[in-house]
């Protein structure tokens, strides 16, 4: 017989030879990191037809790492179903808890023993330090020193000393989230007031108000014979400016050569003013949104 078969889990005892006589026996032992469990044979014989009698390494089992229990408030998940060396053990924590330590342990061979690559991690309760205090405002539960996962606080602004109120810019409610951090940055309390939006040759049609504070929304339409250059809807933003900017009402001209009358409003002007009907969504000059205002 030629050289005997080789296996993943067991190796030949002694040195292999190039040829073996009929009837000659070779013995195997489990490789390092494997251990033998009877009754399967671990030897073979050179048969008279010059082949080796059937033999397998199925009696050699991989060394196994010790069983690890689920961490408290968490779970240990075997990536490939067994504790044999080469295995990966993944750890996750329940909602509201975070991992201290390594989230993956590997079953490794040290000499002939299978051991885990580190200590199992712990699952600790997610806690947040108090959220930031803000100028001109406050938050609920200001006396609490430690917040648990999903605990929420709500911010509100103080009464303003002047005629204009403080507006709350940002999220009014934030909660203690993953990584022991708050879900959003603390909001800001400040006076946000946009200037009165003046549109020459047009008028405001909605969003009327004494003053225009944060998030106030205003809509416009142009007079007959004028079309809107810009957005018909503007919003007062946190920097006290309108976004998009206050639009302009430009005169509709019938030919590209017609020069539009000089207007005091600053800003770029198209040289050709298309007819109003070319602007879908905007009222034609004779179709005021609020006809009673015309």
């Amino acid at each position: 017989c030629e050289a005997p078969p080789t296996f993943e889990a067991m190796e030949l005892i002694g040195k292999p030879k190039p040829y073996y006589r009929v009837g000659e026996r070779v013995d195997y032992k489990c490789k390092k990191g494997y251990f033998y469990i009877p009754p399967l044979a671990t030897h073979t014989i050179c048969d008279r037809n010059h082949t080796w009698l059937p033999v397998s390494d199925e009696g050699c089992y991989r060394e196994m790492c010790p069983h690890i229990r689920d961490p408290l408030n968490g779970e240990a998940i075997l990536a490939n179903g067994s504790y044999e060396f080469g295995a990966e053990l993944h750890f996750i924590c329940n909602e509201g808890y975070y991992l201290i330590g390594k989230d993956i342990l590997y079953c490794e061979l040290k000499d002939t023993v299978a051991i885990w690559s580190g200590k199992p991690p712990l699952c600790e309760k997610i806690l947040c330090t108090p959220p930031p205090k803000i100028k001109n405002g406050k938050h609920t539960f200001s006396e609490v020193e430690v917040f648990e996962y999903l605990d929420a606080v709500t911010y509100s602004c103080d009464p303003a000393p002047g005629p204009d109120p403080f507006s709350l810019i940002g999220e009014s409610m934030i909660y203690c989230g993953n990584n022991s951090t708050w879900s959003h940055a603390a909001p800001e309390c400040k006076v946000v007031k946009c200037r009165f939006p003046v549109v020459e040759n047009g008028k405001q049609i909605s969003g009327f108000g004494k003053k225009f504070y944060y998030k106030a929304t205003v809509m416009f339409e142009c007079d007959k014979g004028y079309y809107l250059n810009g957005s018909d809807k503007i919003v007062c933003e946190s920097n006290s400016t309108w976004d998009p900017p206050v639009p302009k009402c430009l005169k509709v001209s019938t030919s590209p050569t017609t020069k539009s009358p000089t207007s005091s409003a600053s800003g770029p002007r198209p040289t050709y003013k298309p007819p109003v009907s070319n602007y879908p969504g905007y009222p034609k000059p004779d179709e005021g949104i609020l006809n009673n205002l015309d």
Epitope: R195, V199, K203, K211, A265, N292
Partner: antibody
Framework: QVQLQESGPGLVKPSETLSLTCTVS????????ISWIRQPPGKGLEWIGV???????NYNSAFMSRVTISVDTSKNQFSLKLSSVTAADTAVYYC????????????WGQGTLVTVSS | DIQMTQSPSSLSASVGDRVTITCRAS??????LNWYQQKPGKAPKLLIY???SLHSGVPSRFSGSGSGTDFTLTISSLQPEDFATYYC?????????FGGGTKLEIK
């Protein structure tokens, strides 16, 4: 407290240009929106125009072709120029501060009478 | 332009009276209306803005109401210093326009 003071010639000849200034004391012109308003003798008030802090202007279309409102920050003054005047432009001219960007006139100058006559 | 019509153009009243002045706009102006008081030889003074908001320093006997096209200025109990001319002013649309005025005289 901000004070406004109009000044300029009390008499202007027809077809000439009326020029008035509004001096601001107790504040900077760059932070005020100013309107000019006039009142013919024994009559009501008529809005002429406004200049905003960003330098933009809006004018009453009745004066559009002959009015200019401007600001001189170095002198802390606003000015009104009205060209081609006629006797109908005889009036007390006021400068008034637009309140905080809103079109109500909270602070007024004492007014200056301009007579258009040859 | 939006025309502002005040009525009456003049009225006589006595100290202690309740007085109402009306202002009508030629088209809807929401609440974009101000009231001014002017005494002879003086500049106007802002009394009320945005229909009903009292300007600082203005006595509470002055009040304003209305919406759309019809507005009123009410003086609940006339005082001697209230005899003057009163003007309304709209600001929904350029040009901003004033009413013709209402002269309030001592009866």
């Amino acid at each position: 407290q901000v004070q406004l003071q109009e000044s300029g010639p009390g008499l202007v000849k027809p077809s000439e240009t009326l020029s008035l200034t509004c001096t601001v004391s107790g504040g900077s012109v760059s932070s005020y929106d100013i309107s000019w308003i006039r009142q013919p003798p024994g009559k009501g008030l008529e809005w002429i125009g406004v200049i905003w802090t960003d330098g933009g202007t809006n004018y009453n279309s009745a004066f559009m072709s002959r009015v200019t409102i401007s600001v001189d920050t170095s002198k802390n003054q606003f000015s009104l120029k009205l060209s081609s005047v006629t006797a109908a432009d005889t009036a007390v001219y006021y400068c008034a501060r637009v309140y905080d960007g809103y079109p109500w006139f909270a602070y007024w100058g004492q007014g200056t009478l301009v007579t258009v006559s040859s | 332009d939006i025309q502002m019509t005040q009525s009456p153009s003049s009225l006589s009243a006595s100290v202690g009276d309740r007085v109402t002045i009306t202002c009508r706009a030629s088209q809807g102006i929401s609440n974009y209306l101000n009231w001014y008081q002017q005494k002879p030889g003086k500049a106007p003074k802002l009394l009320i803005y945005y229909t009903s908001s009292l300007h600082s320093g203005v006595p509470s006997r002055f009040s304003g109401s209305g919406s759309g096209t019809d507005f009123t200025l009410t003086i609940s109990s006339l005082q001697p210093e209230d005899f003057a001319t009163y003007y309304c002013q709209q600001y929904i649309k350029l040009p901003w326009t004033f009413g013709g005025g209402t002269k309030l005289e001592i009866k």
